[in-house]
């Protein structure tokens, strides 16, 4: 008799997901020298061990720390790009200039970046079939929960001038419910940070506007202010020519604005 | 390859002001980040203040912050410091330096790839 299963609002565990969180610490452990000393089998007993068993509606932070523990990473503190809505051109961005990071290019952003995962209260299975969707389900997931984790502490380790890449093609160029909005930017240490840079990418090829006067990048302003830290904001108005002019920035072409 | 010259530098008295120019020979210096350092004989180069090369964000050492003030006027391809309330400690060679990498902006005189000859600022009590 098949046994009864909570039926989600989310897609399931990412196929293969044991394998690919496997091999993806074996790749980045051989590429970064700084972490050949990570087990990475015992990275994964400590992934599984977050949410394995455990009711997918009833994961915490706490549940997290072996692997937090595990995946201790130093990057440096001023080199960190925050993203919001506009993961692909900040991670073009730092393919280019190998001395920024942003989350995805530490360890623990690297395993679990794009994946989805979840198990079942009591049972040693991993969900295949359905995951909670933050919305229609629960936040407290194990997906939502381990980004909240890694994002708090990425944007804790943050100092001197952080930047931020901004989608200026959505109708929220800054959203409160980002990951960026709801936890990145409360968790920037004022001690430690003096500026918050933002990049507001523009979308359109013939779009001129400042988009830095956005009311929704004035709310940033005003929470960033608040908080003591100095805000600054840049339209790139051709994020090709931006990519292109980081990669070559002695081009001639890299005079007039980017 | 980008040239800068530092000018601006000179002999004042404590609680003085002095306004220190960096400019650079590269019209694609605009977005480069800058930053300012002050070299004492026998010491390192010490980091005084930076800016971003596309939002002009602002960094400063601690013993920077509230008196000195750095900017930057692209159109003429140059870099400020402006000193206010000036004291004998602030004495040095004060090198401009230039960091072609686009985004961030760092303390650290090893990343910056170009650097001024210097200008020297004496404050005396």
């Known amino acids: 008799v098949p046994r009864w299963r909570q039926q989600w609002s989310g897609p399931g565990t990412t196929k293969r997901f044991p394998e690919t969180v496997l091999a993806r610490c074996v790749k980045y452990t051989e590429i970064h020298p700084e972490m050949r000393h990570v087990d990475c089998q015992s990275v994964w007993d400590a992934f599984k061990g977050a949410f394995i068993s455990k009711h997918p509606c009833n994961i915490t932070e706490e549940d997290y720390q072996p692997l937090m523990k595990l995946g201790t990473q130093t990057v440096p503190c001023n080199k960190i790009l925050l993203w919001s809505r506009i993961k692909d051109l900040a991670h073009q961005f730092t393919q280019v200039q190998r001395d920024m990071f942003t989350l995805e290019d530490t360890l623990l952003g690297y395993l679990a970046d794009d994946l989805t995962w979840c198990g079942e209260f009591n049972t040693s299975k991993i969900n295949y079939q359905s995951c909670p969707d933050w919305r229609k389900d629960c936040s407290n997931n194990p997906v939502s929960v381990f980004w909240k984790t890694v994002s708090r502490r990425f944007a804790e380790a943050a100092c001197d001038v952080v930047h931020v890449m901004l989608n200026g093609s959505r109708s929220k160029i800054f959203d409160k419910n980002s990951t960026f909005g709801s936890v990145e930017v409360h968790n920037l240490q004022p001690e430690k940070v003096q500026t918050l840079e933002a990049w507001v990418i523009h979308g359109g090829r013939e779009d001129s506007r400042d988009l830095c006067q956005d009311p929704t990048i004035k709310e940033l302003e005003s929470i960033i202010s608040k908080r003591n830290i100095q805000f600054s904001c840049k339209n790139i108005y051709r994020p090709d020519k931006f990519l292109q002019c980081v990669k070559n920035p002695e081009d001639s072409s890299c005079t007039s604005e980017i | 390859e980008v040239q800068l010259e530092e000018s601006g530098g000179g002999l004042v008295q404590a609680g003085g002001s002095l306004r220190l120019s960096c400019a650079a020979s590269?019209?694609?210096?605009?977005?480069?980040?800058m930053g300012w350092f002050r070299q004492v004989p026998g010491k390192e180069r010490e980091f005084v203040a930076a800016?971003?090369?596309?939002?002009?964000?602002?960094l400063y050492a601690d013993s920077a912050k509230g008196r000195f003030t750095i900017s930057r006027d692209n159109a003429k391809n140059t870099v400020y410091l402006q000193m206010n309330n000036l004291q004998p400690e602030d004495t040095g060679v004060y090198y401009c330096?230039?960091?072609?990498?686009?985004?961030?902006?760092?303390?650290?005189?090893?990343?910056?790839?170009?650097w001024g000859q210097g200008t020297q600022v004496t404050v005396s009590s």
């Open positions: 590269e019209r694609t210096f605009g977005n480069y980040p």
């Open positions: 800016i971003t090369g596309l939002a002009g964000s602002r």
């Open positions: 330096a230039a960091d072609r990498r686009i985004g961030g902006v760092t303390r650290e005189s090893r990343e910056y790839e170009y």
